[in-house]
């Protein structure tokens, strides 16, 4: 999921405690599948670094070999480095595992920016800061790769959490989460709280700070404020959803809603940016430019090349608009909206030329494969992937970066008619052409 960046991800990541936290609100919520309330053992189990992905610690094999694994809701393979590589501190050594089973089958996965290939097998897998279970799961042992692993990212593999339909080499390879649910009593649901730092983190800061939480099998109340609002999963391949309206500072972009979902809209933790179809991107940039016109920025900023910088601590957040995406609700003709701040869509990075200022990259970019709600969106929210009920929930994240004037928001209901018409029906073609390049 990659810069455009599809895999491996480029993200704006970081430490939960570093943003202002919102006060907890009380709310009544419907019953959920799975456990609710406190998942202390899983809270704060993610780490990450700006532009390089959120990862969780996992163990593979017997005796257990510990690896850091990128959490990716935009793919469906569990794949780990299994051979020496200059960017890997450690890798999965199958020969040392008494429980490894070879499937005698290869797998090749090309991305926009590189590729990996490997050998399929199964082994025992567990998540130390996750449910207290061990499962036998399919593992792609990566033996060769190009521009997949990232120098200094601190992760050695990828956990694809989407559905079997997009697994490689084909949909017969059961994804990890399916195996977990089948073999244990873990409910068919997980939730993610990705926490952006609000400023660039160096390697030691990343290791010392929290990147967020992946709650497996449930929902943790402490990770969000207000209510959870759910949107249906349109089709179980990627986590596909339907956007019905887009607003910049409350101004409707006024486009045919099909454009917002052309050719799909997905929620993808393995992509850094909010990626928008060409027409939507152009309209959104025009609107954001107009809203922030008190300052003029280089054209290269809007195109993702040039940074904008301000003297440390003087970023004029107030001149940038909020962005609202309206998502199809669970009830007929009802939608809800999620609103992100510039603190989410301006990604803190260091200027390679000078490091004294606060510099940012515009983290909204153009896509030819539909809308991708990447880390830029997810860092504002606690996101519940309720696979059991075929829906995705959004609530305001307790760790999102904001200021004293505005916070991210999840609000509803709104009346929206003919929302089904907003979905785009992809012509049935060879599924091998699926997007595997992300920014």
């Amino acid at each position: 999921t990659q810069h455009g960046i599809r895999l491996p991800l480029r993200s704006g990541l970081g430490g939960a405690p570093l943003g202002l936290r919102l006060p907890r609100e009380t709310d009544e919520e419907p019953e959920e599948p799975g456990r609710r309330g406190s998942f202390v053992e899983m809270v704060d189990n993610l780490r990450g670094k700006s532009g390089q992905g959120y990862y969780v610690e996992m163990t593979v094999g017997s005796p257990p070999q510990t690896l850091n694994i990128l959490v990716d809701t935009g793919s469906s393979n569990f794949a780990v480095g299994a051979a020496p590589h200059p960017f890997l501190h450690r890798y999965y050594q199958r020969q040392l595992s008494s429980t490894y089973r070879d499937l005698r089958k290869g797998v090749y996965v090309p991305y926009t920016q590189g590729k990996w290939e490997g050998e399929l097998g199964t082994d025992l897998v567990s998540i130390p800061h996750g449910p207290n279970v061990t499962v036998r799961a399919n593992i792609a042992a990566i033996t060769e790769s190009d521009k997949f692993f990232i120098n200094g990212s601190n992760w050695e593999g990828i956990l694809g959490l989407a559905y079997a339909e997009i697994a490689r080499p084909d949909d017969s390879l059961e994804p990890f989460f399916d195996s977990l649910v089948k073999q244990t009593h873990v409910p068919n649901l997980f939730s993610l709280q990705l926490c952006g730092a609000g400023f660039p983190l160096n390697q030691s800061e990343v290791l010392a700070s929290v990147g967020g939480s992946m709650i497996i099998g449930g929902i943790d109340h402490s990770l969000y404020t207000g209510s959870l609002w759910y949107t249906p999963i349109r089709r179980e391949w990627y986590y596909e959803v339907i956007i019905v309206r887009v607003e910049i500072n409350g101004q409707d972009l006024k486009m045919d809603c099909k454009e917002y979902n052309y050719d799909k809209s997905i929620v993808d933790s393995g992509t850094t940016n909010l990626r928008l179809p060409k027409k939507v991107f152009e309209a959104a940039v025009k609107s954001i430019k107009a809203a922030s016109s008190t300052e003029k920025f280089p054209d290269g900023f809007w195109l993702g090349e040039q940074l904008v910088c301000w003297q440390a601590g003087t970023t004029p957040w107030n001149i940038f608009p909020v962005i609202s995406l309206y998502l199809m609700g669970e009830v007929t003709n009802q939608s809800f909206r999620i609103t992100i701040l510039p603190q989410q869509y301006l990604r803190p990075v260091e200027d390679v030329a000078t490091s004294q200022d606060d510099c940012y990259k515009f983290a909204i970019s153009q896509s030819s494969t539909g809308t991708v709600m990447g880390a830029v969106i997810m860092e504002g929210f606690y996101v519940v992937f309720d696979r059991a009920r075929k829906r995705i929930g959004f609530a305001v994240s307790a760790c999102h970066v904001h200021d004293e004037f505005r916070t991210a928001a999840v609000e509803g209901p709104f009346v929206t008619l003919d929302m089904e018409d907003c979905g785009y029906n992809i012509p049935q073609t060879d599924e091998s052409t699926l997007m595997t390049g992300r920014a």
């Epitope: 290269g300 390679v352 030329a353």
Partner: antibody
Amino acid sequence: QVQLVQSGAEVKKPGSSVKVSCKASGGTLSGYAISWVRQAPGQGLEWMGNIIPGFGTANYAQKSQGRVTITADESTSTAYMELSSLRSEDTAVYYCARSGGTRYGMLDVWGQGTMVTVSS
Amino acid sequence: EIVLTQSPATLSVSPGERATLSCRASQSVGSNLAWYQQKPGQAPRLLIYGASTRATGIPARFSGSGSGTEFTLTISSLQSEDFAVYYCQQSFVWPPRTFGGGTKVEIK
């Protein structure tokens, strides 16, 4: 330190096309933009367009629009500039240059140049 | 598009003397202006970016100043290797990223 290595000199007939490559050795194109700049004999520098690999589309100078196509293959860290319907006034040295990672958009690394001669 | 006008077109200077090159933009480019040096048969080389910051490895005798529409490149004491053509370039409003017409610094 990244270097941009361009393909060799070309001699072309009017009306034909030329495709020049630019490979990043010792580094990647990811996160940077690659511009194409040309210089006719004894003339100044002319920016033709650029591409930000992974970001989507290329950007072109109006003068170049229509005849120039800029692409990139991130898997090989190579950018390409194709110029079609060649005429004698396209005879020039074509440079690729890198920018990005900073607020200023300066072209900090240049290829060695590729001489394209258009002659019947 | 933004037009960059460089003056003079040719500057004749003796080694050891100071050279002052000018670049005027048709509209404000903030500090998004760079200066390049080009010698015959070679690719351009970045000297100054952000109007006033020297690129890595560029000697201190090169300095840039200005913002908005008026910019200056100064070479405090010309060395023999400094005789070349100098171009300014803006990257504020683009496409296109325009270059100035160049100033040739020659030996007097």
